[in-house]
């Protein structure tokens, strides 16, 4: 099939005191090969500080996956979710505390 770029959605949720969990979800993409990782100051976090979901079919002939990490509240500006798919890339910030959903479709 033809390339379908992912929808990328970053959310945040309360973790332990002083920390938040940030999750980056990529959905509705094809083919299934994708790079999704959290960066701090533009540098990829080590694998042991991130949790990845499997790349799974979403039932529409496309795929979905996610990556999450825990960060200190107040340091959100240092972190971005980086996505690479089919030769295209994008960077996605952590939403501010009063805005929990950012959706971006990349072409």
């Amino acid at each position: 099939g033809s390339t379908v770029p992912p929808m990328v959605n970053v959310t945040r949720s309360e973790a332990s005191e002083g920390n938040i969990t940030v999750t980056c979800r990529a959905s509705s993409f094809y083919p299934r090969n994708i790079i999704l990782t959290w960066r701090q100051d533009g540098v990829s976090l080590s694998h042991d500080t991130q949790q990845w979901g499997d790349v799974l079919p979403d039932g529409n002939g496309t795929y979905q996956t996610w990556v999450a990490t825990r960060i200190c509240r107040g340091e959100e500006q240092r972190f971005t979710c980086y996505m690479e798919h089919s030769g295209n890339h994008s960077t996605h910030p952590v939403p501010s505390g009063n805005s929990h959903h950012h959706h971006h479709h990349h072409h």
Partner: antibody, heavy 118, light 108 residues
């Protein structure tokens, strides 16, 4: 081959401003942050700030927040550092660098000497 | 601000000798955030070791890094003539990003 090419040396009067450019090549410009670092003659390295060219986010070292301005021109894949209200202590070599996959500074420009003298 | 203190300031050694450079941090740093750079006169720094102990691309195996917490070490097992330079440690764990003041490795 990844390269970062900077603009040439500058001589400025105290109180003036300077704008240094950095043109990376060999990779997708918006995929990595551009950092700026300076080095006074015979001294160590001092981080000024960085910019994410994709979303335009800028993080400054608080020490430079009032005088440094980081920008990018995505149409020409060029990053800029402008430093205002120059004083003699700003005489230094200014470097741009690219954020790496596993370290903050993986490739560097050749440096731009800025001399501030009356 | 995390202050990185490098010692010694200058190391005078002969080719073939072992060089041990220290970097001490004012606060604990995860090993993922400690990097080393080499700078020769008139040149830009270049990445030598990332994340405490990993050799950057093209860096010979005589270079090695170790450490944890507040104390980190760069070792050059047998100095080659091209290794005489200034070495900087750098931390990326907290802002502002900071460098050590450098250790100059000079020919004895």
């Amino acid at each position: 081959e990844i390269q970062l090419v900077q603009s040439g040396a500058e001589v400025k009067k105290p109180g003036a401003s300077v704008k240094v450019s950095c043109k990376p090549s060999g990779y997708a410009f918006t995929s990595n942050n551009i950092y700026w670092v300076r080095q006074a003659p015979g001294q160590g390295l001092e981080w000024i700030g960085y910019i994410d060219p994709y979303i335009g986010r800028i993080i400054y070292n608080q020490q430079f927040k009032d005088r440094a301005t980081l920008t990018v021109d995505k149409s020409t894949s060029t990053a800029y550092l402008e430093l205002s209200s120059l004083r003699s202590e700003d005489t230094a070599v200014y470097y741009c660098s690219r954020s790496g996959e596993r370290s903050n500074f993986d490739y560097w420009g050749q440096g731009t000497l800025v001399t501030v003298s009356s | 601000e995390i202050v990185l203190t490098q010692s010694p300031a200058t190391l005078s050694l002969s080719p073939g000798e072992r060089a041990t450079l220290s970097c001490s941090a004012s606060s604990s740093i995860s090993s993922n955030y400690l990097h080393w750079y080499q700078q020769k006169p008139g040149q830009a720094p270049r990445l030598l070791i990332y994340r405490t102990s990993n050799l950057a691309s093209g860096i010979p195996a005589r270079f090695s890094g170790s450490g944890s917490g507040t104390d980190f070490t760069l070792t050059i097992s047998s100095l080659e003539p091209e290794d005489f330079a200034v070495y900087y440690c750098q931390q990326g764990g907290s802002l502002p990003l900071t460098f050590g003041q450098g250790t100059k490795v000079e020919i004895k």
